[in-house]
Interface confidence: low
């Protein structure tokens, strides 16, 4: 991941990059690679699309080793096959109010976003789409056995669903803060992303964060108890180091991830934090990273269409952050 | 052609200090870092520490307290500084270019004697 | 007991494939550890074989790779020939340091 090597390329001559991504030179000089793309890592290794006004954008002069591929200031966004310019706001639909910065979108959900966990009163929450009304309801189905209800409910716990409220106002500056994006990746290392004005200044900046769902290594399907369908949060194993891009933390963590369901059912972070973390890399570096860490996952039927750009961006964020 | 070449005493005292230095050439200091390594008569190698090229050190945690590496890039030189030498220091110290350990110096033997 | 532990001594006859494990007693060996295989000839300086698990060094013939499985890195030697008689050691890095296995004697047999 850094150029202090002699140049050792694969074997093959150049690799085949899906359509639309650029076939570029590493930021060595040495490799012909596929080109990062927006929001994607990158190094100095592994260089942003050119062709595309992308950079490597690396947050803090401390942190030159990995960076998120970024537009370059005023890059204007696309989004359903309209150009937007940088800082521009609009109602994507009546679900969603967006805002364009630097290339990218970000936006806030309009409609009530919380992940209803089974309580007594509504041991079968459903949400579903009424007639006239933009926004899902929560609907309460009644059990096609009801003699399961009492003593499943005994393994149910009421969860805080909502996180901090996005808007505020301070000092002639209406605070809006999206919610953080679902993390890029369903195992193993990804980013979360999220579009803020929350500065002094009241600009609209982009931050991003690391975040792991579950690792990829790990077979969660198989710890699954006889009888269900569900690991929400599979136990805590032995504390680990993360790994980014050859990087090591510096600090073990006894980090929390989402487990799996067999049942078409998504388990995705509820309830998450963020936090600094150290990574020290081979050439002696040490850089600060945001992370997410996970407090609580939360299983449920709510997951993303591939056929709706809406659902599958935004039915996936993640609430209560406390940071 | 990429070379390193240690040069230093051969004899040191007890408690002497002992400084080697790692002249390189056909590659730049900025661009790769330097490792040191010694190797005891009969015994394995030893890792000892390095310096990045960006100037950062890394050292063996058992040496921690008597290492010191620096490097002049414009010179091409890199300076290995270790005090309070004992016979059980008595080995062939080699540098080798970081990235692989691909290019090693001949070695220099560095007797720690009375 | 050392961190990083390799045999003491291996063998094969020539035109036959050898390989040389390098075991991590701290756990799975991972990219981050940036396995490192080092030969020394019998009086002669080292040359890197092999950096950052499966990078052949330049100049080095591709009867050298480098692997890594579980908590073993392995250097594997195919069409053994008289010339590779020599001293094979193995680096990993440690987050803060490298860590040389003890080397491993490979003879040519015949």
């Known amino acids: 991941q850094n150029c202090s090597g002699p140049c050792r390329c694969p074997d093959e001559p150049a690799p085949r990059c899906p359509a639309g991504v650029s076939l570029v030179l590493d930021g060595c000089g040495c490799c012909r690679v596929c080109a990062k793309q927006l929001g994607e890592l990158c190094t100095e290794r592994d260089p942003c699309d050119p062709h595309k006004g992308l950079f490597c954008h690396f947050g803090s002069p401390a942190n030159r080793k990995i960076g998120v591929c970024t537009a370059k200031d005023g890059a204007p966004c696309i989004f359903g096959g309209t150009v937007y310019r940088s800082g521009e706001s609009f109602q994507s639909s009546c679900k969603y109010q967006c805002t364009c910065l630097d290339g990218a979108v970000g936006c806030m959900p309009l409609c009530s976003m919380d992940v209803r966990l089974p309580s007594p009163d509504c041991p079968f929450p459903r949400r579903v789409k009424l007639p006239g009304k933009c926004c899902e309801e929560w609907v309460c189905d009644e059990p096609k056995d009801q003699t399961v209800v009492g003593p499943a409910l005994a393994a149910y716990r009421l969860e805080d669903t909502f996180g901090p409220d996005p808007t505020m106002i301070r000092a002639n500056c209406l605070v809006q803060t999206t919610e953080w994006s679902a993390c890029s990746k369903t195992c193993g290392m990804g980013i979360s992303t999220r579009v803020t004005n929350d500065n002094a200044s009241c600009r609209l900046e982009k931050q991003s964060r690391l975040c792991m769902v579950r690792p990829c290594e790990a077979d969660l399907e198989e710890n699954i108890k006889k009888g269900k369908k569900c690991i929400r949060t599979p136990k805590i194993s032995k504390p680990i180091k993360f790994e980014l891009s050859g990087c090591t933390s510096m600090k073990t963590y006894r980090a929390k991830f989402c487990g799996v369901c067999t049942d078409g059912r998504c388990c995705t972070p509820h309830r998450t934090t963020t936090l600094p973390v150290e990574f020290k890399c081979p050439d002696g570096e040490v850089m600060k990273k945001n992370m997410m860490f996970i407090k609580t996952c939360a299983c449920h039927y709510n997951c993303p269409g591939d056929n709706d750009i809406f659902e599958s961006l935004y039915y996936r964020k993640m609430y209560g952050d406390m940071a | 052609e990429v070379t390193l070449k240690e040069s230093g005493p051969v004899l040191v005292k007890p408690t002497e200090t002992l400084t080697l230095t790692c002249t390189v050439s056909?590659?730049?200091?900025?661009?790769?870092?330097v490792h040191w390594i010694r190797q005891p008569p009969g015994k394995g190698l030893e890792w000892l520490g390095v310096?990045?090229?960006?100037?950062?050190?890394d050292y063996n945690a058992a040496f921690m307290s008597r290492l010191t590496i620096s490097k002049d890039t414009s010179k091409s030189q890199v300076v290995f500084t270790m005090t309070n030498m004992d016979p059980v220091d008595t080995a062939t110290y080699y540098c080798a270019r970081d990235g692989g350990f691909d290019y090693w110096g001949q070695g220099t033997t560095v007797t720690v004697s009375s | 007991e050392s961190v990083v532990t390799q045999p003491p001594s291996v063998s094969g006859a020539p035109g036959q494939r050898v390989t040389i494990s390098c075991r991590s007693s701290?756990?799975?060996?991972?990219?981050?550890?940036?396995a490192n295989w080092v030969q020394q000839l019998p009086g002669t300086a080292f040359k890197g074989l092999i950096g950052?698990?499966?990078n052949r060094a330049p100049g080095v013939p591709d009867r050298f790779s480098g692997s890594k499985s579980g908590t073993s890195a392995s250097l594997a030697i195919t069409g053994l020939q008289a010339e590779d008689e020599a001293d094979y050691y193995c680096?990993?890095?440690?987050?803060?340091?490298?860590?040389f296995g003890g080397g491993t004697k490979l003879t040519v047999l015949g």
């Open positions: 310096i990045w090229r960006r100037g950062g050190t």
């Open positions: 701290i756990g799975a060996v991972t990219t981050s550890n940036y």
């Open positions: 950052g698990t499966s």
């Open positions: 680096a990993l890095w440690y987050s803060t340091h490298y860590v």
């Open positions: 056909g590659f730049s200091l900025s661009t790769f870092g």
